[in-house]
């Protein structure tokens, strides 16, 4: 049998946020029902994780031997602290789209570990704020965006923006 440390060396995690409790659930991406040491995990999920606090999980299973895999869960900031904001100026709304992630509330997570991604059509931007210029008037554009903490996606949003009519004579 392999050690659990080896077997789960490359385990990945998804973070799910509960807006009512303001707590996260970490979903462990494994094929079998693992045990989580002191942390109880149900259906490979570790519940009630506080934003920006690290949690240590000891992963074991009867298909592997000691030592267990020690997984450090880097819990992201609360999702409601981020808002996708349309920053397009009214006078330029016929040919321009501006989108910005606003941090309306502080958090204790290291901001260095947060990355932002926008995808508008086939254009990809790794920025917190984007401005698309020289667009076609009266066209619909869809922009998808996500935020990652330590390369784990923890929230996403999409906006469909229709550019205004062009000025007469243009």
């Amino acid at each position: 049998k392999p050690t659990c440390d080896e077997k789960y060396a490359n385990i990945t995690v998804d973070y799910l946020y509960n807006k009512e409790t303001k707590l996260f659930t970490a979903k462990l991406n494994v094929n079998e029902d693992v045990e989580c040491g002191n942390n109880t995990c149900t259906n490979n999920e570790v519940h009630n994780l506080t934003e920006c606090k690290n949690a240590s999980v000891s992963i074991s299973h009867n298909s592997c031997t000691a030592p267990d895999k020690t997984l450090i869960l880097d819990v992201p900031p609360g999702v409601e602290k981020f808002q996708l904001h349309d920053c397009t100026q009214v006078e330029k709304a016929d040919t321009t789209i501006c989108l910005k992630w606003k941090n309306i509330e502080t958090f204790t997570c290291d901001t260095q570990n947060i990355t932002y991604r926008f995808q508008c059509g086939n254009m990809i931007f790794d920025n917190k704020e984007i401005k698309l210029e020289n667009l076609e008037p009266e066209h619909e554009y869809k922009c998808d965006s996500e935020i990652l903490y330590n390369n784990h996606k923890f929230t996403n949003a999409s906006k469909i923006i229709k550019t205004d009519f062009g000025s007469p004579g243009e």
Epitope: N103, I104, T106, T111, T115, N127, E129, I130, K131
Partner: antibody
Framework: EVQLVESGGDLVKPGGSLKLSCAAS????????MSWVRQTPEKRLEWVAY????????YYPDTVKGRFTISRDNAKNTLYLQMSSLKSEDTAMYYC????????????WGAGTTVTVSS | DVLMTQTPLSLPVSLGDQASISCRSS???????????LEWYLQKPGQSPKLLIY???NRFSGVPDRFSGSGSGTDFTLKISRVEAEDLGVYYC??????????FGGGTKLEIK
Amino acid sequence: EVQLVESGGDLVKPGGSLKLSCAASGFAFSNYDMSWVRQTPEKRLEWVAYISSGGVSTYYPDTVKGRFTISRDNAKNTLYLQMSSLKSEDTAMYYCARRYDVWWYFDVWGAGTTVTVSS
Amino acid sequence: DVLMTQTPLSLPVSLGDQASISCRSSQSIVHSNGNTYLEWYLQKPGQSPKLLIYKVSNRFSGVPDRFSGSGSGTDFTLKISRVEAEDLGVYYCFQGSHVPMYTFGGGTKLEIK
């Protein structure tokens, strides 16, 4: 190491122009809003310009509006302050400072660069 | 514009004593979102300012717990429970509620008595 390094300060005559630069390193510059803050010879701190992370929004106090322009080049990790129609009261130490968003705080400051406006 | 007035201008203290600095804003700096964006910065001689406190009472990471911030509306206070030699310098309050018209207080110089 997270660092901001200002440059471009000089002695300039009233009515003259000057461009300050602030080189950022050790962090994802394009994710941070940035500001210029100056300190007068009397040691008063004054905020003089603000720019959002992507350069879309800029703000200035009335004392410098129309004379100062803040800009950034995220590809070069550099913040700029173009100053024109300089007055003697613009004499100060100019600091660039990082602010994650408008509702956050200035958590990293540069060491400053000195601008002297005098004939 | 929001005017931030600090008192006293100079504060002579003995090491180990408590120090208290007051900051008063000319109008309420409670934002419509309920938060109060009042910050305190310390500038030591020959250095750039460093953040101590944000949102009235939150200590920035690495700031010793002898520093505490309090207040609401227009009246705010920074307290240092036991002054140490490394605390000497000029303290500035700052309001970030009236975006983008940020304003600093005039500063309070903490010095040895």
